[in-house]
Interface confidence: low
């Protein structure tokens, strides 16, 4: 399933993007998966669909569930699933793990903390920032656009940072908060031309027709936090999202940091129900950053079913 987890707090705005992308001319229909009931597009509804976005204004605990989005083009449909969980507001200061967005790392050189998911909302600066529930005060903290900059970062700056902003929809304002952990690294990082650890160049992977197969593209980009780096798969020189084969999907794997400090990313290509025609495709693992792009090509070959000896 091409699904994405989303979460929010009751009485706050939550906007969810369909995990499947499409051109602007494509229509996107949203359904509540349990009942297959269509989500209305009229903005007077508290929960409504707006193209690739599903809006909860505001969200309620009862909205929790799986929502289906179908991106419709003239030639194919793509289905995605948004797994939405709305939690009750916490009475104390602790932010539970299930409400936390991905941890970010900073160093003396680079200490930006981005406000998670903010790009989905119609918000205006400035953002409010809190650390461990305390409003941030002092000249070391600068709220700049959608991120917080901390000057002269120290190890004591590690902790949970919450951004709070207002989403405006047709003149009505809704509050949104999002929290992520910030860790401080001592070492000076660097980036280098991407190094692909897997797959090997021109690797042949054996697969069984009718079975599922996974290919992992794994690359390293340097030491320390890498702000501009990505790995992705292509099929016959085409992005997976544009290839239009729903059996073949890519999924972001682990962001790995090794004991030697190397920062690496994985992208897993999942092929469901392998078919003969899949053996004819060229699978490219791409790793890229500001230094450039490296490509390793993989082809599939048929694995002969093992003969059992009796």
């Amino acid at each position: 399933k091409f699904s994405k987890q989303s979460w929010g707090l009751e009485n706050e705005a939550l906007i969810v993007r369909c995990p499947r992308q499409g051109k602007p001319s494509y229509t996107v229909d949203w359904y509540y998966s349990q009942t297959n009931k269509s989500i209305p597009t009229q903005e007077r509804n508290r929960v409504f669909a707006s193209g690739q976005l599903l809006k909860f204004l505001p969200a309620a605990v009862a909205d929790s569930g799986i929502y289906t989005c179908i991106v419709r083009s003239p030639t194919f449909n793509r289905t995605g699933y948004a797994n939405v969980t709305i939690y009750k507001k916490q009475s104390d200061c602790n932010v539970p793990d299930y409400l936390m967005y991905s941890t970010v790392s900073g160093s003396e050189k680079n200490s930006k903390i981005y406000c998670p998911t903010i790009d989905l909302y119609n918000w205006t600066a400035p953002l409010e920032w809190f650390k461990n529930c305390q409003a941030l005060q002092g000249s070391r903290y600068r709220a700049h656009k959608s991120f917080l900059v901390i000057d002269n970062v120290m190890t004591e700056d590690a902790g949970d940072y919450t951004c709070k902003f207002i989403h405006n929809e047709n003149g009505a304002n809704y509050s949104v908060t999002a929290t992520r952990s910030f860790t401080v690294k001592d070492e000076q990082g660097f980036s280098l031309f991407p190094v692909i650890g897997a797959p090997a160049q021109n690797e042949i992977k054996e697969v069984e027709i009718g079975k599922n197969a996974n290919l992992t593209c794994s690359a390293c980009f340097g030491k320390g936090t890498q702000f501009l780096a990505a790995v992705l798969w292509q099929l016959n020189g085409t992005k997976i999202t544009d290839f239009g084969e729903p059996r073949i999907q890519q999924e972001e794997g682990q962001n790995q940091s090794f004991s030697n400090g190397l920062a690496c990313l994985d992208m897993v290509l999942r092929i469901a129900d392998v078919k003969e025609e899949d053996l004819l495709l060229q699978y490219d693992c791409l790793a890229l950053n500001l230094h450039g792009l490296r490509r390793h090509t993989v082809r599939l070959s048929r694995k002969n079913p093992s003969k059992e000896c009796f």
Epitope: Q21, P24, S102, Y114, D119, K145, F227, A230, L286, N289
Partner: nanobody, 122 residues
């Protein structure tokens, strides 16, 4: 795209790209160029926060910007050289579907303009 044309070496041009609301709200927008017989190459990109990234080869001659009120993306090109002759394309996308990744790579873009020709003569 608009604003392309012919200019003498050392001159300046500003190309612009008017985008629809859907495309303009994409996380990542950028300029690319393609010279005859060459591959399309990234020139510059700008994300929804206004952070910019440029191809190393440009050495500060080009500036990317956007006007949110007008849904328009710009590329200011100064001290133009004959090797800048190319068709310039505006593009928009979701980065890689990963958070906060916007660099001028073809793979980051989902939507493309028709292109505007820039010719620099010596």
């Amino acid at each position: 795209e608009s604003g392309g044309g012919s200019v003498q070496a050392g001159g300046s041009l500003r190309v612009s790209c008017a985008a629809s609301g859907y495309t303009y709200s994409s996380y990542c927008m950028g300029w690319f160029r393609q010279a005859p017989g060459k591959e399309r190459e990234g020139v510059a990109s700008i994300d929804s926060r206004g952070s910019t990234t440029y191809a190393d080869s440009l050495k500060g001659r080009f500036t990317i910007s956007k006007d949110n009120a007008k849904n328009t993306l710009y590329l200011q090109m100064n001290n133009l050289k004959p090797e800048d002759t190319a068709k310039y394309y505006c593009a928009a996308g979701d980065g890689y579907g990963l958070e906060h990744i916007c660099i001028p790579h073809y793979y980051a873009m989902n939507y493309w303009g028709e292109g505007t020709q820039v010719t620099v003569s010596s």
